[in-house]
Interface confidence: low
């Protein structure tokens, strides 16, 4: 995506979304290469804000402050033209985060979805944000922006993502901006991992010594498959978090992970999924559900479901 004949292409690395105090490299690509260039900030009426400085290849801007947020353009060096400079580049919006309290990010119906389904990511805050921005980790393109809805002292926006495909899986964060400062964003929400299931064949799940055990007896759940999964994920119905283990190749050419549950106290329905290291947020079909029953248990109450940890890091690699 380069500029036109006499139009440079301005880009930002690693992202156009920069934390306050961070750095960003602005690159001006002109005529099949990086030449000398000049930078402009649009809200200064095209007057160079960099004291007439000329840059080569890239300019590292930072540590950034809220004042750095805005729209930038560059002009490439063109010695034989009347002005000595090319036409202005594409506009590039730099957004600076960390200027307001972080919003909250929720997934409806939940963060674990089947391929082809649609998820609503709701970003909300008691700060009266005018706009909300949704950004997927590792994506250099601009975040998606929606106008906030204000109701009963809460501002929110619903981002509809789908039909879900592997490319849409990953770690999402949202930000808010207040009126009249559209590119000065809040601190990021806690990360939310969107996981897509149903892409690969289901693993099998079994229990040792068996699916019905005595209270206090040690239970291990084994997830295995002929597919060379790198990681297995074990979930229990009613619990919001999952456990994960690295898959181990077995002599019989299957790939297996053994989840020790410890002394049995409560039963439950379990499922497992497989995934590959390269796509940690894209999981297999669910195994058939496995009901683990505990006999001789004086208490039939379940532990209260735990909230998913914001640092769950499902979409980060297991090292």
């Amino acid at each position: 995506l380069m500029g036109g004949q006499d139009k440079p292409f301005l880009s930002a690395r690693p992202s156009t979304v920069v934390p306050r105090g961070g750095h960003v490299a602005l690159q001006c690509h002109y005529r099949r290469g990086f030449n000398n260039f000049m930078l402009y900030k649009e809200d200064r009426s095209h007057v160079p804000i960099f004291h007439g400085r000329i840059f080569q290849e890239s300019f590292i801007m930072g540590p950034v402050t809220p004042a750095h947020a805005g729209t930038y353009r560059c002009r490439g060096s063109r010695p034989h033209s009347l002005t000595g400079w090319s036409a202005p580049s594409n506009p590039l919006v730099i957004m600076v985060t960390g200027n307001h309290r972080k919003p909250s990010l929720l997934a409806h119906p939940g963060p674990l979805l089947k391929s082809g389904e649609t998820v609503i990511l709701q970003c909300w805050s008691d700060v009266m944000f005018e706009h909300f921005f949704l950004h997927r980790e590792g994506i250099s393109e601009d975040p998606s922006r929606l106008v906030g809805q204000i109701h009963d002292g809460v501002s929110k926006a619903n981002f509809s993502i789908g039909p879900l495909m592997p490319v849409l899986a990953g770690t999402y964060r949202c930000y808010g901006s207040v009126p009249h400062s559209p590119y000065q964003l809040s601190a990021p929400s806690d990360p939310l991992d969107i996981v897509i299931t149903g892409l690969y064949e289901k693993p099998s799940l079994s229990a040792q010594p068996g699916p019905t055990v005595q209270a206090g007896e040690n239970v291990t759940l084994s997830c295995s498959s002929w597919s060379s999964y790198d990681i297995y994920h074990l979930s229990r119905e009613g619990e919001a978090h999952e456990r994960r283990l690295r898959a181990v190749p077995k002599v019989n050419r299957t790939f297996q992970a053994d989840f020790p549950l410890g002394p049995a106290t409560h039963g439950g329905t379990y499922r497992c999924f497989g995934s590959f290291r390269a796509l940690p947020c894209v999981w297999s079909n669910s195994s058939d559900p496995l009901l683990v029953s505990v006999t001789g248990n004086p208490s039939s109450s379940w532990p209260s479901p735990t909230e998913p940890s914001s640092k769950s890091g499902i979409c980060r690699h297991l090292h």
Epitope: I120, H151, N158, F159, S160, G162, P179
Partner: antibody, heavy 120, light 107 residues
Framework: QVQLVQSGAEVKKPGASVKVSCKAS????????MHWVRQAPGQGLEWIGY????????ENNRKFKDKTTMTADTSTSTAYMELSSLRSEDTAVYYC?????????????WGQGTTVTVSS | DIQMTQSPSSLSASVGDRVTITCRAS??????LAWYQQKQGKAPQLLVY???NLADGVPSRFSGSGSGTQYTLTINSLQPEDFATYYC?????????FGGGTKLEIK
């Protein structure tokens, strides 16, 4: 019930200004953004911009940036749009519309429209 | 800015027919799409929101479908009151552009 009632038709000379009003009733005025849409004779719909009555924040379609000024009076639950430096091509019906709530909201209520005719 | 391309621009049909109007966005708008009906001299009226949801009071012969960049409004068994102009509109960030409109006329 929700109602958006707009001011009556206007005939103006080129170069003049006009202020169109949109009075809201039946809901909390400050809880919804108010948008303006234009329709030239025999043409389609064009989004002009919006105002958030609770903050006064406005956002314009670049095409109309220097043409329109949007304001809101929360005491009377009325949104206004002023069109300046009128030209014949500004002859159109101007609608106000409320952006709804909930999942991926649309314009759920519209005013009846105000016809602005620019003619010398 | 996102462009909305609506087709056809006009359509002749008879009472009882089934008609389909399509709207193509220049980029993925993630179902942030509404359909409106406008009759001569009147304000537009909401038919469908979030691509597939029917607005209150809209007859069930209207339906919306689609995702990504491609969306469709279908009217099953056309009634005399359905002859009007139809517009799509996206809400995936400002400016909220409309499609060019489809004028549905009696054959």
């Amino acid at each position: 019930q929700v109602q958006l009632v707009q001011s009556g038709a206007e005939v103006k000379k080129p170069g003049a200004s006009v202020k169109v009003s949109c009075k809201a009733s039946g809901y909390t005025f400050t809880s919804y953004t108010m948008h303006w849409v234009r329709q030239a004779p025999g043409q389609g719909l064009e989004w002009i911009g919006y105002i958030n009555p609770s903050s006064g924040y406005t956002e314009n379609n670049r095409k109309f940036k220097d043409k329109t000024t949007m304001t809101a009076d929360t005491s009377t639950s009325t949104a206004y749009m002023e069109l300046s430096s009128l030209r014949s091509e500004d002859t159109a019906v101007y609608y106000c519309a409320r952006l709804g709530k909930g999942l991926l909201p649309p314009f759920d209520y519209w005013g009846q429209g105000t016809t602005v005719t620019v003619s010398s | 800015d996102i462009q909305m391309t609506q087709s056809p621009s006009s359509l002749s049909a008879s009472v009882g027919d089934r008609v389909t109007i399509t709207c193509r966005a220049s980029e993925n708008i993630y179902s942030n799409l509404a359909w409106y009906q406008q009759k001569q001299g009147k304000a537009p009226q909401l038919l469908v929101y979030a691509a597939t949801n029917l607005a209150d009071g809209v007859p069930s012969r209207f339906s919306g479908s689609g995702s990504g960049t491609q969306y469709t409004l279908t009217i099953n068994s056309l009634q005399p009151e359905d002859f009007a102009t139809y517009y799509c509109q996206h809400f995936w960030g400002t400016p909220y552009t409309f499609g060019g409109g489809t004028k549905l006329e009696i054959k």
